[in-house]
């Protein structure tokens, strides 16, 4: 799947141990960008012409518990999830000539974590094991960042995505969001 928005729902990034999330699985919901609409008339779409400055990240706050094996934080942590429509896209007709599909127009814009905050959490463990202290890194703010498709993998690792490319047999869809994208973050963190 090309360009998934960075999702940081699994908030437990441990700076010295944490890995970045793997890209989310392919999304099958393509009606937004590939559907016959308006009886074949050129479809209207809200993201075609606006200036990039008009776009911004969403500000969704999620809460979850930090876990480390069988241990779980005494209290949940809350952080921002970076997602949303960051920049304009151009719409091209699909093969039938009636629908539409997304293609990034030139450079791409990502909604990505901007600032982080550290928070110390106490993990409670079963079996009488002593509580553990862990420091987690939580997203404090997001920003729209301009990327080009020539960024290499190492430059992109912060965003948890691979370089933009369509899936075989799929139309590219910029900024599609998936709830799954950050799940690996915690699971890979230890």
């Amino acid at each position: 799947q090309g360009w998934q928005a960075f999702k940081n729902d699994a908030t437990e990034i441990i700076p010295e141990l944490g890995e970045y999330p793997e890209p989310p699985p392919e999304l099958e919901n393509n009606k937004t960008m590939n559907r016959a609409e308006n009886g074949g008339r050129p479809p209207h779409h809200p993201f075609e012409t606006k200036d990039v400055s008009e776009y911004s990240c969403r500000e969704l706050h999620f809460t979850r518990y930090v876990t480390d094996g069988p241990c779980r934080s005494a209290k949940p942590v809350t952080e921002l999830v970076c997602s949303g429509q960051c920049g304009p896209a151009r719409l091209l007709p699909n093969a039938i000539g009636r629908g539409k599909w997304w293609r990034p127009s030139g450079p791409d814009f990502r909604c990505i974590p901007d600032r982080y905050r550290a928070q110390r959490v106490q993990l409670l463990c079963p079996g009488g094991e002593a509580p553990r202290a862990r420091k987690v890194r939580l997203v404090a703010s997001c920003k729209c960042k301009r990327l080009t498709r020539f960024h290499n993998q190492s430059e992109l690792k912060d965003f948890g995505t691979e370089a933009a490319r369509p899936q075989k047999g799929r139309k590219p869809r910029p900024r599609a969001r998936s709830a799954k994208a950050n799940q690996a973050e915690l699971e890979n963190a230890y």
């Epitope: 099958e28 969403r58 969704l60 949303g84």
Partner: antibody, heavy 119, light 107 residues
Framework: QVQLVQSGAEVKKPGASVKVSCKAS????????MYWVRQAPGQGLEWMGI????????SYAQKFQGRVTMTRDTSTSTVYMELSSLRSEDTAVYYC????????????WGQGTLVTVSS | DIQMTQSPSSLSASVGDRVTITCRAS??????LNWYQQKPGKAPNLLIY???GLQSGVPSRFSGSGSGTDFTLTISSLQPEDFGTYYC?????????FGQGTRLEIK
């Protein structure tokens, strides 16, 4: 095709709890946020919270904080909304709704579950 | 929290009329604004997403505009089946909030 099927109507007494289920089918369950929205008789729509079915993280409206719990069972592609300490004002139709992954809108809704709180 | 203020709260119009419903956000929400139509006893149905995108299957007489804090839903030529209650909804930030609704009656 995408479907969200909710559990049946419930009648509860004040102080009790209710747990409403929403079974998803026709898409990859863990790829889409699920929301809960309620509507009291003759009133408008009220957002209760959101759950990420993938990791289970949640976000609740302040009004329901401490009374609502949203969970999911990935093995059955079902999300649950439990509301405790029920009062008569909680009488409403409760909807689950899936959020479109690209455009941030509710593209599919459950049929609604009427919860009546009465002594 | 972002408050969404819809106006009017109700209106009565004739078939063929041009109808406009407005929605104002208490702070900027970019274009994260959706419009839904709800008929009695039914779940809401999406009309317009992202302020101006026409949802698949929705008649072209419906249109949306606006960005930032002020948004408009327009029905260019009212049809008998357009009765119901219309809601705006911001999806920019949690808590997600809805307008109080506009009840549209056909004269």
């Amino acid at each position: 095709q995408v479907q969200l099927v909710q559990s049946g109507a419930e009648v509860k007494k004040p102080g009790a709890s209710v747990k409403v289920s929403c079974k998803a089918s026709g898409y990859t369950f863990t790829n889409y946020y699920m929301y809960w929205v309620r509507q009291a008789p003759g009133q408008g729509l009220e957002w209760m919270g959101i759950i990420n079915p993938s990791g289970g993280s949640t976000s609740y409206a302040q009004k329901f904080q401490g009374r609502v719990t949203m969970t999911r069972d990935t093995s059955t592609s079902t999300v649950y909304m439990e509301l405790s300490s029920l009062r008569s004002e909680d009488t409403a139709v409760y909807y689950c709704a899936r959020e479109d992954t690209a455009m941030a809108y509710f593209d599919y809704w459950g049929q609604g579950t009427l919860v009546t709180v009465s002594s | 929290d972002i408050q969404m203020t819809q106006s009017p709260s109700s209106l009565s119009a004739s078939v063929g009329d041009r109808v406009t419903i407005t929605c104002r956000a208490s702070q900027t929400i970019s274009n994260y604004l959706n419009w839904y139509q709800q008929k009695p006893g039914k779940a809401p149905n999406l009309l317009i997403y992202a302020a101006s995108g026409l949802q698949s299957g929705v008649p072209s007489r419906f249109s949306g505009s606006g960005s930032g804090t002020d948004f408009t839903l327009t029905i260019s030529s009212l049809q008998p089946e357009d009765f119901g209650t219309y809601y705006c909804q911001q999806s920019f930030s949690t808590p997600i909030t809805f307008g109080q609704g506009t009840r549209l009656e056909i004269k």
